[in-house]
Structure formats: structure tokens, C-alpha cells
């Protein structure tokens, strides 16, 4: 009598997460009688996946009708595969007994699960930085398998090179995570700029996932200040203008001081945006020259985005 063979024809099978995996197994003889059991892993710690005779295995079904006469096909189908199902599966023949006795194992089929990476999440610095400073952006994506993955950073379509990327864990795992940090040098023109983290993986069929961050969340463009005097009006009133230009974000408070005393405080709101995303604001102060005996020192004080105030002063000459 020929020795019974347990044949697992595929060394490996790769399945997309969410799909079903078919693990093939045939035996060469009905004899000796006894169950076929499927295990994940080998040795004492192996996990029972399916036993045709005993137990209930809701995610596992027999491919062939096991009740069909002369059935020697003990292939199984595992539904709704997740990365946690990855591993080597063994089809094992037992001889009927009390208890059943293991007789022969198939060579094993390695199931690898192709799992898509999660949508990349890009986070920027906690506090804003000014132009000519370098800020860091982080991109994270999780749950992918296999481990091979490509991550690229772009700023306004140009690839960034100051990048550090790690894929964890380093060893074998059911799924992996990637974390990458890009260092970006800010310029005054970056209010409308965008950084993109692009992740390419075998599961994505050449259609990479992208995560974005707007530099507008990370940048502060401090204002330029200019104080000028318009010509004296007939009623002895002088119009002094404080021009605050090229700032971002809009959060700005302007205070006029006359000889060091607060004259008026204004908050910027609903300003029109410049092409580069920055804002301009002009404030006027009318000074009644006839009410003063000495020259008047006017100060335009600007507090931008919670930063220390910036002053620009101007003296209005009072003629004797």
C-alpha cells in the first residue's frame, strides 16, 4: 500500500485584506480514515484554524463538499482576510483514534496579506515660525503589508530632500507603520504653499495616497510698518497714516499713542488678501495741531499674532 501523501501545492499565497484566501490541500488516499485539520504555524503553539469533524469555524469553509464520496480535496477558504491572518498554514492528516493521532503534514502554505496603508496624516509644527526658519512636518501611515513602501515629500510640486523616514517594526510583522519627518525652509512667499506627503505601495495599483498640510498653518510673516503725514488741512488738522503691509496671519492689533498716551486701538478684520496670501492694513489718525503747544510724537504700535509689539514713531511739528 502506498504511503499517504498530503499535498499543499502552493508554497505561498498572497491576498488583499478583505478578500478570501483559498488554501489548497489534497490527500492521496482515503486510508487510513481520520480527520484533516488545518493549523497556522507549527509546533506546540500552533493555532487550529479548521477541523472538518469537530468544532465550528465561521470564517472557514471547505472548498469541496467533504461529504462527497471519495473526497480527497480538503482545501479551505478563509473569508474576510485581515493582516492578522498572515502566517504559514499546514494541512495535517490525523488517524482516527481516541484521541486522533497526527499522521502527516503538508509542506505548508505561507499566506501573506496585502493591506493598504491608511491615508497619510500630515502634522506641522505646534507654533508658527517666521520666514528663513526651518520647520518640521511629520507624515504617518499605518496598517500596510508587505513592508516595502515608498514615501516622498513635495513642496509646491518640488520634491524635498531633507527627509528622515522610518518603517516599523524592523522585524517580521502582520502589518507595518511608516513615519517620516521633512524639514522645510520657510520664505515670505509661503503663505499659499503646500507640503504633500505621498505614499506608494503595491496595494495601491500605482495610485499613491497623499496627505497635505498648508504652510499657512505654520508660517508667520511679520508686518512692515510705515508712518507718513499728509499735508496740513485748512482746519489745522494733520492726517497721519500708519501703513502695515505684507503680514500673515490676519490677527493684528494696532494702537495709536500720542506722546506716549493711548489714543485709539483697532483690531484688523475682514481684510482683503494680497496675491501672495499676506494682508495690508492702513490706519489714519487726525491730529488737531492747534490743541498742542509743542511737537506731537505719534507712535503706531502693532502687535501681530501674539508677538511682541513693533513701534514706528513720527513727530508732528507744531509751529509757534
Amino acid at each position: 500500500e502506498e504511503e499517504l501523501q498530503v499535498i499543499q501545492p502552493e508554497k505561498s499565497v498572497s491576498v488583499a485584506a478583505g478578500d478570501s484566501a483559498t488554501l489548497n490541500c489534497t490527500v492521496s488516499s482515503l486510508i487510513p480514515v481520520g480527520p484533516i485539520q488545518w493549523f497556522r504555524g507549527a509546533g506546540p503553539g500552533r493555532e487550529l484554524i479548521y477541523n472538518l469533524k469537530e468544532g465550528h469555524f465561521p470564517r472557514v469553509t471547505a472548498v469541496s463538499d467533504p461529504t462527497k464520496r471519495n473526497n480527497m480535496d480538503f482545501s479551505i477558504r478563509i473569508s474576510n482576510i485581515t493582516p492578522a491572518d498572515a502566517g504559514t498554514y499546514y494541512c495535517v492528516k490525523f488517524r482516527k483514534g481516541s484521541p486522533d493521532v497526527e499522521l502527516k503534514s503538508g509542506a505548508g502554505t505561507e499566506l501573506s496579506v496585502r493591506a493598504k496603508p491608511s491615508a497619510p496624516v500630515v502634522s506641522g509644527p505646534a507654533v508658527r515660525a517666521t520666514a528663513e526658519h526651518t520647520v518640521s512636518f511629520t507624515c504617518e501611515s499605518h496598517g500596510f503589508s508587505p513592508r516595502d513602501i515608498t514615501l516622498k515629500w513635495f513642496k509646491n510640486g518640488n520634491e524635498l530632500s531633507d527627509v528622515q523616514t522610518n518603517v516599523d517594526p524592523a522585524g517580521k510583522s502582520v502589518s507595518y507603520s511608516i513615519r517620516s519627518t521633512a524639514r522645510v525652509l520657510l520664505t515670505r512667499r509661503d503663505v499659499h504653499s503646500q507640503v504633500i506627503c505621498e505614499v506608494a505601495h503595491v496595494t495601491l495599483q500605482g495610485d499613491p495616497l497623499r496627505g497635505t498640510a498648508n504652510l499657512s498653518e505654520a508660517i508667520r510673516v511679520p508686518p512692515f510698518l510705515e508712518v507718513t503725514q499728509q499735508s496740513m488741512r485748512a482746519d489745522n488738522q494733520v492726517n497721519v497714516t500708519c501703513q502695515v503691509t505684507k503680514f500673515y496671519p490676519q490677527r493684528l492689533q494696532l494702537t495709536w499713542l500720542e506722546n506716549g498716551n493711548v489714543s485709539r486701538t483697532e483690531m484688523a478684520s475682514a481684510l482683503p488678501e494680497n496675491k501672495d496670501g499676506t494682508y495690508n492694513w492702513t490706519s489714519w489718525l487726525l491730529v488737531n495741531v492747534s490743541a498742542h503747544r509743542d511737537d506731537v510724537k505719534l507712535t503706531c504700535q502693532v502687535e501681530h499674532d501674539g508677538q511682541p509689539a513693533v513701534n514706528k514713531s513720527f513727530s508732528v511739528k507744531v509751529s509757534a
Epitope: I31, K53, E54, D65, P66, T67, K68, R69, N70
Partner: antibody, heavy 121, light 111 residues
């Protein structure tokens, strides 16, 4: 330990009805075909009926001598198999065994102790 | 229906000798290279106990002195060496097709 325990036998008059029950334990009942076999001094061992699995749509098969009179059924949630016997005849007298079919081939590896049915006026 | 004829109806065998029981089917019970014949032992007051499956394979827990052979329509159960506890009635049964049928039995007596 596999156990099959029949109940429901007794003395019946010809033309009467009786239901035999068999409760199984020690194995996953829903994964096995179940059978009834009877034994009498006159006819020896005689296969009566078989019921298959849910995946086989609980297909049933009967010996010609009981077709139309006997009905085999199962309740997997109770690990039980039944034999409803109607229009009983004297020749239905015997010991009725509940049997597990191990390998879907009338491989009768476990038998209950049997329950006795006597049909007599 | 397939009719199974057992012979002899009874036999007496001395302790330690060979007992041979024959079972002949009215039609072949072999398909796809397998012989769908089973042998059972029954002692008084007990249900039958499976000894041999698929004509020649020893059921788990059955002593090796029991053996089966044959194919097609002719099958044999051998017991050697016979022991006192082997005194019983032996039945053949087929599953070649529905309905399953049993032989009439062979009563073995130990001398």
C-alpha cells in the same frame, strides 16, 4: 467520550405512532450524518434511515420498507436526532439503534445502546 | 438492493486457531479503487462494534488479530489467533449504494 442515548421505545398497537429520540454528546453533532438501524430476530440488522448535514440540505434516505411511514429529523442545536414512526406494523418490532456515521459512507463507528419497540395488538 | 450472504451461519474454532468468515455481495461494492465493506462484532445485549472499514482497514482500538480482505463481491474476515473474548456474532455491511444492507451474521463459538 462519544455517547448516543436513545429513548421513546415501548409497546404500541399496529397502526399507531411513536417518536424515538437520540441525544448525542462528546462530539460536534452538526458535522456528522446520523442513522437509525433496527434489529430483530426475524430480519437481523436492517438499516432504516439516514439524515445528512445542513450543508447537504438535511437530505434524508429511507429503507423501502419504511418509506412514507417513517420520518428522520435532527435538531443540531440540541444535538438530537429523531425517528417519527407512523402507521406501525408488527414487522417494525425490534431494537432501534441510533448511529453516528463517521466518514459520510455508512461508516457506523458509534452505536447507542438501543431502544426497544414492540408492535402488537 | 445489494444482498450480502454470509457463510458459515455459525462456526466453532479452537482457542488460538484461525476463524474465517465469508461475505458475498450480489453486486460489486467497489468504486474508485475502494471497497465499501465493513465488519462488525456483536455480543449479547450490546450494540454492534465496528472492527474493519473499507474491507481491510482496522478500526482504531481493535486488536491486530482481526483482519479483512477482498474486493468487488467477495470479502473475508479473519481472526487469528482466536481468543475467548472473540465469541460473538459477526456481520458484514456494505455502503456501495443506498440502501445500506447487512449480512445475516455468523455466530462464532470458541472451543
Amino acid at each position: 467520550e462519544v455517547k448516543l442515548e436513545e429513548s421513546g421505545g415501548g409497546l404500541m398497537q399496529p397502526g399507531g405512532s411513536m417518536k424515538l429520540s437520540c441525544v448525542a454528546s462528546g462530539f460536534t453533532f452538526s458535522n456528522y450524518w446520523m442513522n437509525w438501524v433496527r434489529q430483530s430476530p426475524e430480519k437481523g440488522l436492517e438499516w432504516v434511515a439516514e439524515i445528512r448535514l445542513k450543508s447537504n440540505n438535511y437530505a434524508t434516505h429511507y429503507a423501502e420498507s419504511v418509506k412514507g411511514r417513517f420520518t428522520i429529523s435532527r435538531d443540531d442545536s440540541k444535538s438530537s436526532v429523531y425517528l417519527q414512526m407512523n402507521n406501525l406494523r408488527a414487522e417494525d418490532t425490534g431494537i432501534y439503534y441510533c448511529i453516528r456515521d463517521y466518514d459520510y459512507d455508512a461508516y457506523f463507528d458509534y452505536w447507542g445502546q438501543g431502544t426497544t419497540l414492540t408492535v402488537s395488538s | 438492493d445489494i444482498v450480502l450472504t454470509q457463510s458459515p451461519a455459525s462456526l466453532a474454532v479452537s482457542l488460538g486457531q484461525r476463524a474465517t468468515i465469508s461475505c458475498r455481495a450480489s453486486k460489486s461494492v467497489s468504486t474508485s479503487g475502494y471497497n465499501y465493506m465493513y465488519w462488525y462484532q456483536q455480543k449479547p445485549g450490546q450494540p454492534p462494534k465496528l472492527l474493519i472499514y473499507l474491507a481491510s482497514n482496522l478500526e482504531s482500538g481493535v486488536p491486530a488479530r482481526f483482519s479483512g480482505s477482498g474486493s468487488g463481491t467477495d470479502f473475508t474476515l479473519n481472526i487469528h489467533p482466536v481468543e475467548e473474548e472473540d465469541a460473538a456474532t459477526y456481520y458484514c455491511q456494505h455502503s456501495g449504494e443506498l440502501p445500506y444492507t447487512f449480512g445475516g451474521g455468523t455466530k462464532l463459538e470458541i472451543k
